[in-house]
């Protein structure tokens, strides 16, 4: 489908001359025909901002140790998270790691494992928590 160009501008470092007033809206990309935009294909590609791209960005496929938190739409990339029982610290590129099964002796669990953090344990006699 061909849709009208956006007249809103967005900063872009890729180009020496940012084509202001020629940007396509989120969920679409530039056509090979000047002045036209093509819609992204749901589940295949996306653009999350006004853009001058000649194709939508490819949707990310979740890794084998991850599950889909939210699917790729024409305006938002796939969101992936670690599968239950595994976690990865925020902003880390490492593989998902198994959650700890329990706290060390003398400590008690105060927080369950989430896809983003391991269980949290605190000393029985103190209120100060720390990750292990």
């Amino acid at each position: 489908a061909t849709i009208k160009l956006h007249d809103q501008s967005i900063g872009t470092q890729q180009w020496e001359h940012s084509p202001l007033g020629e940007l396509c809206p989120p969920g679409s990309h530039r056509s090979e025909r000047p002045g036209a935009c093509n819609r992204c294909t749901e589940g295949v590609g996306y653009t999350n901002a006004s853009n001058n791209l000649f194709a939508c960005l490819p949707c990310t496929a979740c890794k084998s140790d991850e599950e889909e938190r939210s699917p790729c739409t024409t305006t938002r990339n796939t969101a992936c998270q670690c599968k239950p029982g595994t976690f990865r610290n925020d902003n880390s590129a490492e593989m998902c790691r198994k959650c700890s099964t329990g706290c060390p002796r003398g400590m008690v669990k105060v927080k369950d494992c989430t896809p983003w953090s391991d269980i949290e344990c605190v000393h029985k006699e103190s209120g100060n928590g720390h990750n292990i």
Epitope: E16, H17, P34, G35, N52, L53, F54, A55, P58
Partner: antibody, heavy 118, light 111 residues
Framework: EVQLVQSGAEVKKPGASVKVSCKIS????????IHWLRQAPGEGLEWMGW????????GSPQKFHGRVAMTRDTSISTAYMELTRLASDDTAIYYC???????????WGQGTLVTVSS | QSALTQPASVSGSPGQSITISCTGT?????????VSWYQQHPGKAPKLMIY???NRPSGVSNRFSGSKSGNTASLTISGLQADDEADYYC??????????FGGGTKLTVLG
């Protein structure tokens, strides 16, 4: 049949500029984006940037920023590519090509040999 | 150094089939189906032979076919003919909104 016809060969000194032209016939000049590419002797192809013939805006990779200018004269259906501050490694055949519907280039101009030599 | 990797040369006899590979990354060949192949005879401009991985423009022989697996695209020419002898270049659109090419493969038709 769409045809892209380019200007003739040029010999330039280092530090000079060159302006290559590309005349489109057989279809509307403004129907598709125009791209510029080059090929050094015995080497592969290198993409230099895109040009919007309606608005006159252009985009090029970082490597050519500040050195390449793409313009047009719609009255004669001609696009131009000017490369400044020429060096010996700019010696190449320069091509214009139209953007095909699938992010490909088709057809191409016949090429313009630019030789940079002192 | 080209962004996409192709073998420098391949050869085959008339009637045989040959395959030329083109290896990139997730950001180009692996990220999109916008892979093209161009044929270039000496002293001539490149000619589009395959677009979108496996589509032939009208007028291109069905002896030319394309495929892709992961980050590697391939061009296969079956029933080799003398005038297939040329340089072949692969190209891909990239997630950086640019185009990259392979270094080219010289095809020699023996005999």
């Amino acid at each position: 049949e769409v045809q892209l016809v380019q200007s003739g060969a040029e010999v330039k000194k280092p530090g000079a500029s060159v302006k290559v032209s590309c005349k489109i016939s057989g279809d509307s000049f403004t129907a598709y984006f125009i791209h510029w590419l080059r090929q050094a002797p015995g080497e592969g192809l290198e993409w230099m940037g895109w040009f919007n013939p309606i608005s006159g805006t252009a985009g090029s990779p970082q490597k050519f920023h500040g050195r390449v200018a793409m313009t047009r004269d719609t009255s004669i259906s001609t696009a131009y590519m000017e490369l400044t501050r020429l060096a010996s490694d700019d010696t190449a055949i320069y091509y214009c090509a139209r953007q095909h519907h699938s992010n490909t280039f088709d057809p191409w101009g016949q090429g313009t040999l630019v030789t940079v030599s002192s | 150094q080209s962004a996409l990797t192709q073998p420098a040369s391949v050869s085959g006899s008339p009637g045989q089939s040959i395959t030329i590979s083109c290896t990139g990354t997730n950001s180009d060949v692996g990220g999109y189906n916008y892979v093209s192949w161009y044929q270039q005879h000496p002293g001539k401009a490149p000619k589009l032979m395959i677009y979108e991985v496996n589509n032939r423009p009208s007028g291109v022989s069905n002896r030319f076919s394309g495929s892709k697996s992961g980050n590697t695209a391939s061009l296969t020419i079956s029933g080799l003919q003398a005038d297939d002898e040329a340089d072949y270049y692969c190209s891909s659109y990239t997630t950086s909104n640019t185009w990259v090419f392979g270094g080219g493969t010289k095809l020699t038709v023996l005999g």
